[in-house]
């Protein structure tokens, strides 16, 4: 569920506060609630370029777990499809920490809507 | 040449354990995720688990959850399924394939292990 | 859990002639992040399983190009363009975008 999401977060949180990755991503702070399947994609997408630069496999594995719950969770409510909102490439570049924090953020949003 | 050499099977009671092992030659076994997969005689696949390259995660299908355990060492290049409440259901080939992880672009079961039979049967 | 259906069960070809297997699910397996995890394989009479596509149109490594997959959504198939007598099996769809994984019953391919 969500909350398993939520600690995969902060475990990659910890993870990369260990090895100073210090990319910038495409980051929804302000995500519309008729926006989130799509922001939770982009920030999923995002993951994956930390996994990718990191080369950790702790990171690597958590990412993965953490797309997979994602995956499961948002199919049990069956196909979503939203219009209007921001191509992953239109969100503004934020630090990994303000990525992070962000993507806890969205993810509360679902848990509140569930 | 990938190699995986799934062993441990046999003859087992209902109710009774086995623990299979598949090892893995030929390429950098802790690169990638596991999986196993069985087959029925005269029947179609199974998928039966999979585990993260580090190990720290599982996943399972209803069927053998709670009595199926994968795990691996990644020191031993050696994959396991720890079975437990073995049931005449689970009589099949038991197959342990390599997985291509989902962040490098594939996600499929790329190559696969020659299987070891599993029996259960009193 | 997505079914994967897949038809027909038996397919008898005559050499040299296209071989088509389809392969539906019940839901979409499009995943969140975009991509279709669906691979086709090929199990050989007494052998293990092969890889055969994956990701629903890419070819693995060393498979013939006479083998192609296409598809998106729900629905998808897998051409043979000319049969040879080293085809006959069974095929296999499979899907890995939702847990738990699913295969397709099997489509048994035979030589009339």
């Known amino acids: 569920n969500w909350v398993n999401v939520i600690s995969d977060l902060k475990k990659i949180e910890d993870l990369i506060q260990s090895m100073h990755i210090d990319a910038t991503l495409y980051t929804e702070s302000d995500v519309h609630p008729s926006c989130k399947v799509t922001a939770m994609k982009c920030f999923l997408l995002e993951l994956q370029v930390i996994s990718h630069e990191s080369g950790d496999t702790d990171i690597h594995d958590t990412v993965e777990n953490l797309i997979i719950l994602a995956n499961n969770i948002l199919s049990s409510n069956g196909n979503i499809t939203e219009s209007g909102c921001k191509e992953c490439e239109e969100l503004e570049e934020k630090n990994i920490k303000e990525f992070l924090q962000s993507f806890v953020h969205i993810v509360q949003m679902f848990i509140n809507t569930s | 040449e990938v190699r995986l050499m799934a062993s441990g099977g046999g003859l087992v009671q209902p109710g009774g354990s086995l623990r299979l092992s598949c090892a893995a030659s030929e390429f950098t076994f802790s690169n990638y995720a596991m999986s196993w997969v069985r087959q029925a005689p005269g029947k179609g696949l199974e998928w039966v688990a999979t585990i993260s390259r580090g190990g720290d995660y599982t996943y399972y299908p209803d069927s053998v959850k709670g009595r199926f355990t994968i795990s691996r060492d990644n020191s031993k290049n050696t994959l396991y399924l720890q079975m437990n409440s073995l049931r005449a259901e689970d009589t099949a080939v038991y197959y342990c394939?390599?997985?291509?992880?989902?962040?490098?672009?594939?996600?499929?079961?790329?190559?696969w292990g020659q299987g070891t039979l599993v029996t259960v049967s009193s | 859990d997505v079914v994967m259906t897949q038809s027909p069960l038996s397919l008898p070809v005559t050499l040299g002639q296209p071989a088509s297997i389809s392969c539906r699910s019940s839901?979409?397996?499009?995943?969140?992040?975009?991509?279709?995890?669906l691979e086709w394989f090929q199990q050989r009479p007494g052998q293990s399983p092969r890889l055969l596509i994956y990701?629903?149109?890419n070819r693995f490594s060393g498979v013939p190009d006479r083998f192609s997959g296409s598809g998106s959504g729900t629905d998808f198939t897998l051409k043979i363009s000319r049969v040879e007598a080293e085809d006959v099996g069974v095929y296999y769809c499979?899907?890995?975008?939702?847990?738990?994984?699913?295969f397709g019953q099997g489509t048994k391919l035979e030589i009339k």
């Open positions: 499979f899907q890995d975008s939702f847990v738990p994984y699913t």
């Open positions: 990701k629903v149109f």
């Open positions: 839901q979409s397996i499009v995943d969140i992040t975009g991509n279709t995890y």
């Open positions: 394939a390599r997985r291509v992880s989902m962040i490098t672009g594939g996600w499929a079961m790329d190559y």
